[in-house]
Interface confidence: medium
């Protein structure tokens, strides 16, 4: 299902745009996986960590069959904007422990911003509405401790990894339907 009748596509080949988005998503997934592994080496995680402010995972094995391109792109963009905010917060609030990951966190943020720009371009080419997040943006509070910021980093990187993993699968599946 494409845009409503009467709304012209700017791009001649949305599949090529989608390919480009998939490549960027895959690249970011690899970076995130590498940084998450680096985090586990430097700061071993004692179990799974969660953060209430992170978005809930949008896709699962059960929902893959019913995916629609507008919904996937909109939700992915909203979720990635949330992760971008969390990465920016980590870089500012993390303290000296996380400063040792600064080059990698900075690169991750830059690639996340690039992917978001690509998704925005793709949505405009497909004449999809640039939906704003449903909920108001809640400011992220300071970590309770340095240890707390490390736990938050584990949660953010773990959540981003899962989100990107499902995004790659979802986008590839949607490409076959275009």
């Amino acid at each position: 299902p494409g845009p409503p009748a009467g709304s012209p596509r700017v791009s001649s080949d949305p599949r090529a745009d989608l390919d480009s988005a998939v490549l960027l998503t895959r690249s970011l997934l690899a970076d995130t996986r590498q940084l998450a592994a680096q985090m586990r080496d430097k700061f071993p995680a004692d179990g799974d960590h969660s953060l209430d402010s992170l978005p809930t995972l949008a896709m699962s094995a059960g929902t893959l069959g019913s995916l629609q391109l507008p919904g996937v792109l909109t939700r992915l963009r909203v979720d990635l904007m949330s992760y971008l905010r969390h990465v920016q917060w980590l870089r500012r609030a993390g303290g000296p422990s996380l400063k040792t990951l600064e080059p990698e966190l900075g690169a991750l943020q830059a690639r996340l911003e690039r992917l978001l720009r690509r998704l925005q371009l793709l949505m405009s080419r497909l004449a999809l509405p640039q939906a704003a997040p449903d909920q108001p943006v809640i400011p992220l509070g300071p970590p309770a401790s340095a240890w707390g910021s490390i736990r938050a980093a584990h949660a953010i990187l773990g959540g981003l990894h899962l989100t990107l993993d499902w995004a790659v699968r979802g986008l590839l599946l949607l490409k076959t339907r275009l």
Epitope: A93, G95, P96, K99, P142, A144, S145, A146, W147
Partner: antibody, heavy 117, light 110 residues
Framework: QVQLLESGGGVVQPGRSLRLSCAAS????????MHWVRQAPGKGLEWVAV????????FYADSVKGRFTISRDNSKNTLYLQMNSLRAEDTAVYYC??????????WGQGTLVTVSS | QSVLTQPPSASGTPGQRVTISCSGS????????VNWYQQLPGTAPKLLIY???LRPSGVPDRFSGSKSGTSASLAISGLRSEDEADYYC???????????FGGGTKLTVL
Amino acid sequence: QVQLLESGGGVVQPGRSLRLSCAASGFTFSHYDMHWVRQAPGKGLEWVAVISYEGSNKFYADSVKGRFTISRDNSKNTLYLQMNSLRAEDTAVYYCARTPGSHFDYWGQGTLVTVSS
Amino acid sequence: QSVLTQPPSASGTPGQRVTISCSGSSSNIGSNYVNWYQQLPGTAPKLLIYYDDLRPSGVPDRFSGSKSGTSASLAISGLRSEDEADYYCAAWDDSLSGVVFGGGTKLTVL
């Protein structure tokens, strides 16, 4: 309540060494990064060093790099500052401070180090 | 010379509003949170503002912080005699890999 108590200050000759301690209580010491900040008589605050909560990451001000070493013993809830090759310009009140991330939320009362011949 | 620049002194009469500025660069204020500390005569510094504009519990709402680009400011409204103290801004500096302070501003309540 959170308490930070510095000790080990005193008068020392240039070139000699001194070790400062900071005893922490009232919080889970091993969860917090810790800093040393100093203040020369009549002057402003100067950051000295920081150590991460588990002790593996350390950063120092250029003015003390290679001479001062920050360390901690989480089992004793104590922060240390080993000061070697002391100079007259190291004369200051030394404060230890706790940080949850990017700010110092609790400070000790300070200990005075005087480097003089 | 301090990495962050503050005016050495500021003054005001009781009830007045005073503002203290703090100027830095992209590697400190521009990319990290700004914190403000109050040091009353003969005492250790105390956290006044953190995360650019947040107040710890116990700090009166007469104190407020703000940031724009590579500059920050501390505003004190309804000035009181007990506000007479030294005020310091601070931030992490990514280039120096450490915390940098302003030179401090001595506030006098006339």
